[in-house]
């Protein structure tokens, strides 16, 4: 038998990335009114972090928010994609069909009818695989009919998607090997939908689209990448800085405000009418009356 199995290659999957600031830790941006007079030029030139003035307000690039784009967001939406795909490049040899020149032409009636039969056969072969989506014939060539095709797999994104797709590709290999061993011509008769050459089954390549939330998170956080981490909630990855509340890495600034800087998250402590707050997490309160007497 010459069933050959390949190495796995990976490709990156693009994710639609949007960046959000956390409402609970973000000051409300005052409603902008149309600016008149010389002061406007000053406001325009004060947009920070690559923000641009649109005549009314600063338009902030991803990663920043605030009236002057001075604040760093605490949460970045990194997806994930709803589904992850895999593609297996396979070759099987169909012996129950004669190769004709018409089969080279993908728009011919002959090709369409062959495709219909082949697809129906493969749908039966792979019917027990939940990740199976379908087959796509890439090329037909002489030798009874050598069918180069892709088996398409897809699964819902979970952190274990790679294991799920790896398992599915193994089942595909098992099933195609089995059917091409069992459904063979005997005395010039194919008693099944299609018959195969047992030794003509090859798996050339397996491509799984890769999704790496940690890598995406780091990239999207740019110069703040060292401080953003991925945490999972309901199997969904969240790219957050310690300034985002409600996660295990969240920094508790008590009555202060968490603010991201290039040196990391810092608590900006507040002063009330009665107290000064200090300390790394603004947890040390000093009563003003004790200082002033």
């Amino acid at each position: 038998r010459t069933t050959s199995f390949p190495t796995v290659t990976t490709t990156a999957v693009p994710t639609n990335t949007t960046i959000k600031s956390n409402p609970t830790s973000t000051p409300t941006v005052p409603r902008t009114t149309t600016c008149f007079g010389d002061g406007c030029q000053n406001t325009a030139s004060r947009c920070k972090n690559g923000g641009t003035w649109d005549g009314l307000k600063c338009q902030c690039p991803n990663l920043y928010y605030g009236e002057l784009c001075e604040e760093v967001v605490s949460s970045i939406d990194i997806g994930p994609p709803e589904t992850i795909s895999a593609q297996m490049e396979l070759t099987v040899t169909v012996t129950s069909v004669k190769f004709t020149e018409e089969l080279k032409n993908h728009s011919s009636q002959e090709f369409q009818e062959f495709k219909q039969t082949f697809t129906e056969q493969m749908n039966i072969v792979y019917s027990g695989i939940p990740e199976y989506v379908g087959v796509n014939i890439t090329k037909l060539r002489l030798g009874s009919v050598v069918v180069e095709h892709d088996v398409l797999l897809r699964t819902k994104y979970t952190p274990e998607y790679k294991t799920v797709l790896d398992n599915a590709t193994e089942v595909v290999k098992e099933k195609i090997t089995k059917v091409t061993t069992q459904q063979i011509m005997i005395n010039d008769i194919c008693s099944d939908m299609m018959c195969f050459n047992t030794t003509g089954t090859q798996v050339q390549n397996i491509t799984v689209t890769q999704y790496d939330p940690e890598e995406d998170c780091r990239k999207m956080a740019k110069e703040y990448g060292d401080y953003f981490v991925v945490e999972y909630r309901d199997q969904k990855p969240y790219c957050i800085s310690p300034c985002e509340p409600g996660f295990s890495v969240s920094k508790n600034c008590n009555l202060g405000k968490c603010q991201m800087s290039l040196s990391g998250p810092q608590c900006l402590c507040v002063t009330t009418e009665t107290h000064w707050y200090s300390g790394e997490t603004c947890n040390q309160g000093t009563q003003k009356s004790l200082v002033y007497g």
Partner: antibody, heavy 121, light 107 residues
Framework: QVQLQQPGAELVRPGASVKLSCKAS????????MNWVKQRPEQGLEWIGR????????HYNQKFKDKAILTVDKSSSTAYMQLSSLTSEDSAVYYC??????????????WGQGTLVTVSS | DVQITQSPSYLAASPGETITINCRAS??????LAWYQEKPGKTNKLLIY???TLQSGIPSRFSGSGSGTDFTLTISSLEPEDFAMYYC?????????FGGGTKLEIK
């Protein structure tokens, strides 16, 4: 949809020959083997043979090897069966029948209406 | 040649009943047996192939079972249109051979 059209009846003299036709429509004629089946009253069905319209490759039931000749005319999408040296034993209904899938499948979802051949002087 | 013995050759039943028709091959034909329905004035209808695979468009009251040498066609809850002639056919080897037929009539 797939259709196999056969003439209703043929009356022939003993010792003569007859050429039965089966005109196919609704599919690509050259991609499916055509089978011929004989049915005599009270005697069930007998498979005579089959032909690949693409290159005229044939397989015969040995019993009919010297009785039937299968041919095709690709231009008119028609299959033919010539029966020779006819006797009363050849009086029967003859069906053409097609397999379900592209290639060589020996079960038949598509049948013609059949041609009744009567051998009589 | 593979001989196919079909039984019974005649069967009377009433609508709503369940009936079985049997075919026995003279040697093993694996799962490769087909069943057909024949009615006057209509083209023959394929019901089952490969022993138990229901042809598309055929009602699920028709079912096939068996492998090797013994096969059964079951029609559950007979409908008036089911009364007809039934044939089995082995599609395992040349020459393809048919059973002698079963005539199913209304009781």
């Amino acid at each position: 949809q797939v259709q196999l059209q056969q003439p209703g009846a043929e009356l022939v003299r003993p010792g003569a020959s007859v050429k039965l036709s089966c005109k196919a429509s609704g599919y690509t004629f050259t991609t499916y083997w055509m089978n011929w089946v004989k049915q005599r009253p009270e005697q069930g069905l007998e498979w005579i043979g089959r032909i690949d319209p693409y290159d005229s490759e044939t397989h015969y039931n040995q019993k009919f090897k010297d009785k039937a000749i299968l041919t095709v005319d690709k231009s008119s999408s028609t299959a033919y069966m010539q029966l020779s040296s006819l006797t009363s034993e050849d009086s029967a209904v003859y069906y053409c029948a097609r397999g379900p899938y592209y290639g060589t499948n020996p079960w038949f979802p598509y049948w013609g209406q059949g041609t009744l051949v009567t051998v009589s002087s | 040649d593979v001989q196919i013995t079909q039984s019974p050759s005649y069967l009377a039943a009433s609508p709503g009943e369940t009936i079985t028709i049997n075919c026995r091959a003279s040697k093993s034909i694996s799962k490769y047996l087909a069943w057909y329905q024949e009615k006057p004035g209509k083209t023959n209808k394929l019901l089952i192939y490969s022993g138990s695979t229901l042809q598309s468009g055929i009602p699920s009251r028709f079912s096939g079972s068996g492998s090797g040498t013994d096969f059964t066609l079951t029609i559950s809850s007979l409908e008036p249109e089911d009364f007809a002639m039934y044939y089995c056919q082995q599609h395992h080897e040349y020459p393809y051979t048919f059973g002698g037929g079963t005539k199913l009539e209304i009781k």
